[in-house]
Structure formats: C-alpha cells, structure tokens
C-alpha cells in the first residue's frame, strides 16, 4: 500500500489555517494517516487526521487559531509530515519544510452583491475573507460571468491586476439571467495558487424600455 505514486500538497490561507491533501495510488481507503506540524519558532505543535475525499485522496485542516488571527509570518518555517499507521508503528510517508507565504491559497471571496444593475451593465462588489493584512494591496482577482447556454469553463476570464473589490460588467443583454464568480490570489509566493471560486451570484439585467430598440 506504500508503493504507488504519492503526492503531498499544503497551502496556507494567510491567517490561521493550513490545508493539506495527501494522495496515494493503491493505498487502502481505511489507511490511518495524520499530518503533523512542527514550527521552528512557535510553541505549538498541531496534528490533523487525514480523512478520505476520494478513492485515493485524503485531506485535513490544521487549525492554528481563530479564523482572523495572524498565526504565521513570512519568516516562519513549519515542518509538515505525513505519518501513516502500519500495524503497530507509524511510518513517515512525506516531509516538507513549509514556508507559509510561499504556499498561499486564500479563502474564496464572500459577500458578493449587486450594487447597481441596468439593461446592459451590472456593478458587483465582494469582500475578501481571512486575508492577511501583510498583503496590503498586493492581490489580484479573476472574475467570470456565466451567460445563458454556456458553461463556466467557456466563460472568458476577466483579470483585475490590483486589489479592486468590485467590477462593472458591460455589454450585457437586457432581461437576461447571469451568474458571476470571482477568485483571489496574492502576488507573493512561488507555489501560491488561486483561491477557490466564490459562490456564484445570480442576477438579472433590466428589461429594455418599451418602444426603444
């Protein structure tokens, strides 16, 4: 059960959570594994139980404190180990010296709302969640709009290369139902990746005024 291809990936949400995924081809579903976190300059150690999320994949969250507390900085190093039970002993399956601000994945943006909607335009705002104050304005966003008869994958990506928590969508069709999503990424970190997409916000453009083209 230990000879398959394995992969261990973790991301820091910039505040008080390190989320990890451990995958291993050929591993037994009932294998008992944990992630151990051992920081270099903090008094705490943390462990989380890896729970199955698919046939050969397990995940867990290291909760370091209250959601908005700043538990790690750019100078911290947290050694992360995957330990799996083999009979009566634990075997180390993976180890990495984790630099939190090189491996960022923020929470999805929240509180999406329509600020103003017209026949052809819609102004939408959102908020970032549990994002470190260290970033100041060094964030970027991607947004996409789902049009009728299309899929999310077909939706063109709009890039906002600055910390701008609103967008004005234009050239929309009157009296039409749309959905909108946004995601965020810090500029910092070699292995940093996009946040999950926000929950979709549904909105409808105003109908065209009667008697006008």
């Amino acid at each position: 059960a230990v000879n398959g291809t394995s992969r261990f990936t973790c991301f820091y949400n910039s505040r008080a959570n390190i989320s990890c995924v451990w995958s291993q081809d050929g591993a037994l579903q009932d294998t008992s594994c944990q992630v151990h976190a051992w920081p270099d300059r903090r008094r705490w150690n943390q462990t989380c139980e890896l729970l199955p999320v698919s046939q050969a994949s397990w995940a867990c969250n290291l909760i370091l404190g209250t959601p908005d507390s700043q538990k790690l900085t750019a100078v911290d190093i947290v050694t992360l180990r995957v330990m799996c039970r083999e009979g009566v002993r634990w075997r180390m399956m993976a180890i990495q010296d984790f630099k939190p601000f090189e491996n960022l994945r923020l929470m999805a943006p929240i509180s999406l709302q329509v600020v103003h909607v017209e026949t052809h335009r819609c102004n939408i705002s959102w908020k970032i969640s549990q994002a470190s104050h260290y970033f100041e304005r060094h964030l970027e966003f991607e947004a996409r709009t789902l049009s009728p008869g299309h899929t999310w994958e077909e939706a063109p990506l709009m890039t906002l290369k600055q910390k701008q928590e609103w967008i004005c969508l234009e050239t929309l069709t009157p009296d039409t139902q749309y959905e909108f999503q946004v995601r965020v990424k810090p500029l910092q970190g070699e292995f940093t990746t996009w946040s999950p997409w926000s929950q979709p916000l549904a909105f409808r453009t105003k109908p065209a005024a009667l008697g006008k083209d």
Epitope: N3, W38, D40, T79, R91, M93, A94, Q96, K99
Partner: nanobody, 126 residues
C-alpha cells in the same frame, strides 16, 4: 536555468573523510528538497541522503547511516555531504540532485528528482 555543480571529490584511504559541496543556481534553493545520489562503476544510480528545504528533516540510506551527514547553507545556496569512515564500497561518482518540490517522500527517495549535476568522483582505496 537550474545549475548544480559538485566539488570536493578525490582519493582517500579507508577510514578517511571527505566533504562534498554542491553549488546551486537558477532557482530559489530553500524552496526545494535536495539529495545526494551516487553511481559506482558498472552499477545503477543509488540514493544516498536527502534533506528538506531548511534542513529540518534528513534521511539516509542504511549503507551510509551514522557515517555520512547531509546539510545545507541556504544563504550560500550550497548543499553538503560530510563523509566519514569511508569504505572502498563508497567509491562512486557522487551527484547532487534537486527535487521538483519542497516535499520529500521517504518510502520512495528517488521520486520527484528533476535535476542533477555532473558529479564528482570519490575513490576509496588503500
């Protein structure tokens, strides 16, 4: 581009010591796990030791455990292998190797290596 340049090899008598160095460039050294591997004449590549990005985790092949020490200096972007109590069977070309991520997998130490240097010859003979 990634470059790994080994040095410090040479000829030594059994029981002697050598310290190998590997100068790395072209990538953020501290973000990657590293290892030493070796190839004896007429043999395949053999894993020797691995180290995590900041040296907080190290691992050794049974054949060198207690005699070799892997370490790194991230300020100088350099990997080291201190070899003590050398034996004739340690004779090989020693290569420094970079892993493709910050993660090292102890059950499969060869996995994930994406670059290695040109090697430095170590000969142990009386």
């Amino acid at each position: 581009q990634v470059q790994l340049v080994e040095s410090g090899g040479g000829s030594v008598q059994p029981g002697g010591s050598l310290r190998l160095s590997c100068a790395a460039s072209g990538f953020t050294f501290s973000n990657y796990a590293m290892s030493w591997v070796r190839q004896a004449p007429g043999k395949g590549l053999e894993w020797v030791a691995s180290i995590t990005g900041f040296g907080r985790g190290t691992d050794y092949a049974d054949s060198v455990k207690g005699r070799f020490t892997i370490s790194r200096d991230n300020a100088e972007d350099t990997l080291y292998l201190q070899m003590n109590s050398l034996k004739p069977e340690d004779t090989a070309v020693y290569y420094c190797a970079k892993y493709s991520s910050s993660t090292y997998y102890p059950p499969t130490p060869a996995r994930g290596r994406d670059y290695r240097g040109q090697g430095t010859q170590v000969t142990v003979s009386s």
